[in-house]
Interface confidence: medium
């Protein structure tokens, strides 16, 4: 399934954002984890820029396995919410938030779920959505992100993520894979790729490729457990590299490199 919606107005919209069940008014969304950079930031309002700002180059640069390679893939994993589920609910979490791997190397986007009742196997669905905004462009040119951020922050929504939260009609949406029991089915676009759902609900790519950059949503559906936080997402960025220089987007904190 591929949906290529193309709007002509503002690049951000009223996306779904975080999924908190309405019956849990006491359960606040977990704030996004932003990572700081030095005084050059100059902009207190750049909540999203902080996602791009800091030290991936410092974390990655000294790793010998990274030198001289053509590209790297950076996976930024983000829990959409974090709260205790009530009875008869699903709790989906994305853990191990940092993966830096070489292009064409494997990567696993970890996802686990807990259910309060398990009479039937739930369906695990991994869905891909392209970024709402160009992370690289915003990292290189912070002015291009300011206007939209200012509007959102002025509306009292400092947790707004302009790269993830927008209407599906203005981005590409695809089902990557689904799993029920031991049966894994790849979406049409991913047929022929060595991609599978392993373990509890982890999405594993044998080889990452150009075009894999985007937001990956892990959702778990069960007829018995209708409440709860049944979705979490991971951001995956495929980046080109200068040979011998491990400078990527200015600002992600690097996790371990998988080679």
């Amino acid at each position: 399934m591929q949906q290529d919606g193309l709007g002509v107005g503002t690049r951000n919209g009223s996306g779904k954002g975080r999924s908190v069940h309405p019956s849990w008014p006491w359960c606040a969304p977990r704030p996004l984890r932003y990572f700081g950079r030095d005084a050059r930031a100059r902009r207190a309002q750049t909540a999203a820029m902080a996602l791009l700002a800091g030290g991936l180059s410092r974390g990655l640069g000294s790793h010998p396995a990274a030198a001289g390679r053509d590209a790297v893939v950076f996976v930024w994993l983000l829990l959409s919410t974090w709260c205790t589920a009530p009875a008869r609910a699903i709790q989906v979490t994305v853990s191990n938030p940092y993966h830096v791997v070489i292009l064409f190397q494997p990567v696993t986007l970890p996802c686990t779920y807990q259910m309060t009742s398990t009479p039937t196997q739930p369906i695990v669905i991994w869905k891909y959505k392209s970024f709402c905004r160009d992370r690289i462009a915003d990292a290189f040119s912070p002015a291009s992100v300011d206007n939209q951020l200012n509007a959102q922050l002025a509306a009292g929504n400092p947790g707004y993520n302009p790269y993830v939260e927008c209407q599906d009609s203005v981005r590409t949406v695809r089902v990557v894979a689904t799993k029920q029991g031991n049966a894994v089915t790849l979406g049409d676009y991913y047929q022929g790729r060595r991609i599978t759902i392993t373990g509890n609900a982890d999405l594993t790519f044998d080889q990452t490729a150009w075009g894999d950059s985007g937001v990956y949503y892990c959702s778990v559906v069960s007829a018995q457990d209708l409440q709860g936080n049944n979705e979490a997402y991971a951001e995956l960025i495929v980046l080109g590299r200068t040979s011998g220089v491990a400078e990527l987007l200015p600002g992600f904190q690097a996790g371990p490199i998988e080679d």
Epitope: D4, L6, G7, V8, R11, R40, S57, A71, S130, F131, D134, I136, A137, A139, F140, S141, P142, A143, S144, R171, T172, Y189, A209, W210, G211, S213, G214, I237, V238, L239, G240, R241, T242, V245, E247, L248, L249, P250
Partner: antibody
Framework: EVQLVESGGGVVQPGRSLRLSCAAS????????MHWVRQAPGKGLEWVAV????????YYADSVKGRFTISRDNSKNTLYLQMNSLRAEDTAVYYC????????WGQGTLVTVSS | QTVVTQEPSLTVSPGGTVTLTCASS?????????PTWIQQKPGQAPRALIH???YKHSWTPARFSGSLVGDKAALTLSGVQPEDEAEYYC?????????FGGGTKVTVL
């Protein structure tokens, strides 16, 4: 009004060096990434290099990697391209372009590498 | 080596419609490649028309529109004017690298 003015082009022998400049005005230069793009005579556009708003991150096309260096001086609102070990195939008009979507372009400066 | 492919040339009548396409050797072009379309007239510097697949600059005439068609990025000129005769370049972003297509020469006859 946004203006980008390239300079520094000329005729140079193979193996020699040249430094191009791009003077920017009409926008907050220090807030935007900048590109260099070139066009050989009668040919298409070729991306050369990009630099982030603060100069901390740079990317290069494979064809110039290790020979060309992109830099900027935000206090002077100027973008630079240092070109070393020039080859005949580097002969082209060199353009600077603003932001990563290349919304504004300069008029270009011609670099001719010839013995 | 990544290659971006465009039609070498297309001919259109004044008032007609023409669609230029842009393909990537790496597979389907999606919005994640942030397709950009640039126009260049003979003897002039390039000028950006469309960015991020379909977004127009303030100076872009309404008759130009960008989209994704199948596995390609597309630029459609509707109600073509004589002044639209030019070379049109597609630009795709591959992480930290930008690749231009070879350009499409649009002739208005």
């Amino acid at each position: 009004e946004v203006q980008l003015v390239e300079s520094g082009g000329g005729v140079v022998q193979p193996g020699r060096s040249l430094r191009l400049s791009c003077a920017a005005s009409g926008f907050t230069f220090s807030s935007y990434g900048m590109h260099w793009v070139r066009q050989a005579p009668g040919k298409g556009l070729e991306w050369v290099a990009v630099i982030s708003y603060d100069g901390s991150n740079k990317y290069y096309a494979d064809s110039v990697k290790g020979r060309f260096t992109i830099s900027r001086d935000n206090s002077k609102n100027t973008l630079y391209l240092q070109m070393n070990s020039l080859r005949a195939e580097d002969t082209a008009v060199y353009y600077c372009a603003k932001d990563l979507n290349m919304d504004y372009w300069g008029q270009g400066t011609l670099v001719t590498v010839s013995s | 080596q990544t290659v971006v492919t465009q039609e070498p040339s297309l001919t259109v009548s004044p008032g007609g419609t023409v669609t230029l396409t842009c393909a990537s050797s790496t597979g389907a072009v999606t919005s994640g490649y942030y397709p950009t379309w640039i126009q260049q007239k003979p003897g002039q510097a390039p000028r950006a028309l469309i960015h991020t697949t379909s977004y127009k600059h303030s100076w872009t005439p309404a008759r130009f529109s960008g989209s994704l068609v199948g596995d390609k990025a597309a630029l459609t000129l509707s109600g073509v004017q004589p002044e639209d005769e030019a070379e049109y370049y597609c630009l795709l972003q591959y992480g930290g690298a930008w690749v231009f297509g070879g350009g499409t020469k649009v002739t208005v006859l």
